[in-house]
């Protein structure tokens, strides 16, 4: 079964900077990645970035830079402006779409005990409806 992992990392040198890393574990090619915060895509979450493997990336504040790391993983750098956007207590979600086969989404956050510079373990937090797009023709 395909799986999505999410890591949230606080930068050691700049405590206001965070990076979200997401990856897709499974067969098939990814056609679109959506990163949101505050909840899953379309369920209360606010989009931060969308990435297309050929057409490029789009991002919205407070996202600073979205990029592909591999064909199945992405990273998103964020700039925390302070109390107005407490990233340390925020859930980040990544949705990997493979049209028309399916889409898979998981969420993660910075562990409360994380030291700056240490990334969260890649423990997927699957969204229950993450496989609702499985199509078989």
């Amino acid at each position: 079964t395909p799986e999505v992992w999410v890591q949230v990392q606080m930068e050691a040198t700049e405590l206001s900077s965070f990076t979200v890393h997401c990856g897709f574990l499974g067969p098939g090619s990814i056609s679109l990645v959506t990163v949101s915060w505050g909840g899953p895509d379309g369920a209360g979450g606010t989009k931060l970035a969308v990435l297309h493997p050929e057409l490029g990336t789009r991002q919205w504040a407070p996202a600073r830079q979205a990029r592909w790391e591999t064909q199945s993983s992405i990273s998103l750098a964020l700039e925390d402006s302070g109390a107005s956007s407490p990233f340390a207590n925020t859930t980040f979600c990544c949705k990997f779409a493979s049209f028309p086969e399916g889409s898979w989404e998981s969420c993660g956050s910075l562990p409360p005990s994380s030291d700056p510079g240490l990334s969260a373990p890649p423990t997927p937090v699957p969204i229950l409806r993450a496989d609702h797009h499985h199509h078989h023709h």
């Epitope: 679109l32 989009k47 969308v50 057409l55 789009r58 049209f99 889409s103």
Partner: nanobody
Framework: DVQLVESGGGSVQAGGSLRLSCVAS????????MGWFRQAPGKEHEGVAH???????RYVDSVKGRFTISQDHAKNTLYLQMNSLKPEDSATYYC???????????????WGQGTQVTVSS
């Protein structure tokens, strides 16, 4: 996620017409575009038509003048009126919502289960 349910597919003779419908529930305006893709067996999927958030319809060249995409916002429904159908239009048609990276393409973020269109000669 937004839920998309298509209907209106079926079998028709070449030259005939079909009207596809797509009802969107839990629709949000977080995406840029809404439209129709199709995929025939053994072929790559292609974007047939979509409507931008500004209401501008866009079509792939092969359907221009034959297909018309429209929306009924009150019913949260998207339509695709298909006239002068050809055998090469046979495919599974998917309703999609997605994001724009250029004028001509609506990259799917969510989609329905699809509805089958078969055009015989």
């Amino acid at each position: 996620d937004v839920q998309l349910v298509e209907s209106g597919g079926g079998s028709v003779q070449a030259g005939g017409s079909l009207r596809l419908s797509c009802v969107a529930s839990r629709y949000t305006s977080r995406t840029d575009c809404m439209g129709w893709f199709r995929q025939a067996p053994g072929k790559e999927h292609e974007g047939v038509a979509h409507i931008d958030s500004d209401g501008i319809p866009r079509y792939v060249d092969s359907v221009k003048g034959r297909f018309t995409i429209s929306q009924d916002h009150a019913k949260n429904t998207l339509y695709l009126q298909m006239n002068s159908l050809k055998p090469e239009d046979s495919a599974t048609y998917y309703c999609v919502v997605g994001f724009k990276f250029d004028d001509d393409y609506c990259a799917p973020n969510d989609w329905g289960q699809g509805t089958q269109v078969t055009v015989s000669s």
